[in-house]
């Protein structure tokens, strides 16, 4: 049932904060979708707590989550992908708290991969390319990507570029010469589906050429 439990046995449980957040990943394993939930308070005693999703499912009323250490997880084909589901934290048959969530609004894409940077000597620029599994998907195909790069010595001075394609050109003159750069990329749904940024791709490191003293241009590496 929706709302908070009122059973005397659960009085102690009711004092706890059972706030939780979830994200969905569509077609994460072939045609299977996943839903991952976790408590916002890491100190919640999860020993007897279960998660259940009801509604907006195909030919079943409810599904139970599997517990994987601190997170709760479902992998299934049975999401209707329209309308709101009721996700509840339960102790036995009693619901401690519930949230109505549309799974299409909490989509977290998979992280981009195969990030690489190629220097083009003639063009004096760097071509950044990466790949995403979403190009092959039926649902979450349209993504906005966030490419972030920084000089390795600048701990928190990231430059961000948003793009919808998987290719970006960085002009050599916008970068420091003879410097080591770190670059990474993440993605977020950008059409129909809504949600969260993916995890960052693994970082890629590249060095800019030195300046050629006679011409004032960088030397290729």
């Amino acid at each position: 049932e929706s709302g908070y439990a009122q059973n005397g046995d659960l009085e102690d449980a009711e004092l706890d904060d059972y706030s939780f957040s979830c994200y969905s990943q569509l077609e994460v394993n072939g045609s299977q979708h996943s839903l991952t939930c976790a408590f916002e308070d890491p100190d919640v005693n999860i020993t007897n707590l279960e998660f259940e999703i009801c509604g907006a499912l195909v030919e079943v009323k409810c599904l139970n989550f599997r517990k994987l250490q601190e997170i709760y997880f479902i992998e299934t084909k049975k999401f209707l992908l329209i309308g709101k589901s009721n996700i509840c934290v339960k102790v036995g048959e009693k619901s401690l708290t519930c949230k109505k969530i549309d799974l299409t609004t909490i989509v977290k894409p998979e992280a981009p991969f195969d990030l690489s940077v190629v220097y083009r000597e003639g063009a004096n620029d760097f071509v950044v390319t990466f790949n995403t599994s979403h190009l092959q998907k039926k649902y979450v195909k349209v993504l906005m990507h966030d490419v972030a790069y920084r000089q390795e010595k600048d701990e928190n001075k990231w430059t961000h570029v948003n793009l919808s394609s998987t290719k970006l050109t960085l002009l050599q003159r916008k970068l420091q010469p003879a410097a080591m750069y770190e670059i990474k990329v993440r993605s977020i749904p950008d059409h129909y589906f809504k949600g969260f940024w993916s995890e960052w791709s693994p970082s890629y490191y590249f060095r800019t050429p030195e300046i050629n003293n006679s011409s004032g241009e960088m030397d290729p590496i």
């Epitope: 009801c54 907006a56 992908l81 329209i82 549309d102």
Partner: antibody
Framework: QVQLVQSGAEVKKPGASVKVSCKAS????????MNWVRQAPGQGLEWMGL????????SYNQKFKGRVTLTRDTSISTAYMELSRLRSDDTAVYYC????????????WGQGTTVTVSS | EIVLTQSPATLSLSPGERATLSCSAS?????MHWYQQKPGQAPRPWIY???KLASGIPARFSGSGSGTDYTLTISSLEPEDFAVYYC????????FGGGTKVEIK
């Protein structure tokens, strides 16, 4: 205004199939489920199944699974319900109904299509 | 599958009287909806998610309940309220009750 307009009455013989259409207007067709509910003469309401028009995913009442097929054509905002292997007890009024995805109730209904199965 | 039992099957009352319609579920239901149907017409949404009135429904109607027992109440019957009312569970397979006919006494 939001409207669901269904195809006209049908008379079918036992063993035949019937296909009823439901044309939606006044809202984004792909944003709501389309449900099918039937009502036999003098009887109550019986949910048959639904389709998500965005992706074509269907969910059927087990009672009708294998006999009912729900489809849609998003280009003309129309949903279809086909019932095969008709029997005399399939004689009923068939309704399409839009599903409100926030609360899962049927907030807009078609006018109904009478299907008579008789030899 | 949940069975929804509506009682009474028929309720004979006069305009101005209070009507109480019951819907009992064979196991717990989180949300219940109600529809009104008049002869020869499609059902109309009446009350959704236990107690929320659908668009244009007058305030003399109210809904309540939890778990297995739900109620639709009409505080003072008007002539246009005489009809059949169906309850329905919110979740698959969206089962309807058998209906309660509210008729003029």
């Amino acid at each position: 205004q939001v409207q669901l307009v269904q195809s006209g009455a049908e008379v079918k013989k036992p063993g035949a199939s019937v296909k009823v259409s439901c044309k939606a207007s006044g809202y984004t067709f792909t944003g709501y489920t389309m449900n099918w509910v039937r009502q036999a003469p003098g009887q109550g309401l019986e949910w048959m199944g639904l389709i998500n028009p965005y992706n074509g995913v269907t969910s059927y009442n087990q009672k009708f699974k294998g006999r009912v097929t729900l489809t849609r054509d998003t280009s003309i905002s129309t949903a279809y319900m086909e019932l095969s292997r008709l029997r005399s007890d399939d004689t009923a009024v068939y309704y399409c109904a839009r599903g409100d995805g926030n609360y899962w109730y049927f907030d807009v209904w078609g006018q109904g299509t009478t299907v008579t199965v008789s030899s | 599958e949940i069975v929804l039992t509506q009682s009474p099957a028929t309720l004979s009352l006069s305009p101005g009287e209070r009507a109480t319609l019951s819907c009992s579920a064979s196991s717990s239901v989180t949300y219940m909806h109600w529809y009104q149907q008049k002869p020869g017409q499609a059902p109309r949404p009446w009350i959704y998610e236990i107690s929320k009135l659908a668009s244009g429904i007058p305030a003399r109607f109210s809904g309540s309940g939890s778990g297995t027992d739900y109620t639709l109440t009409i505080s003072s019957l008007e002539p246009e309220d005489f009809a059949v009312y169906y309850c329905q569970e919110w979740n698959y397979p969206y089962t309807f009750g058998g209906g309660t006919k509210v008729e003029i006494k």
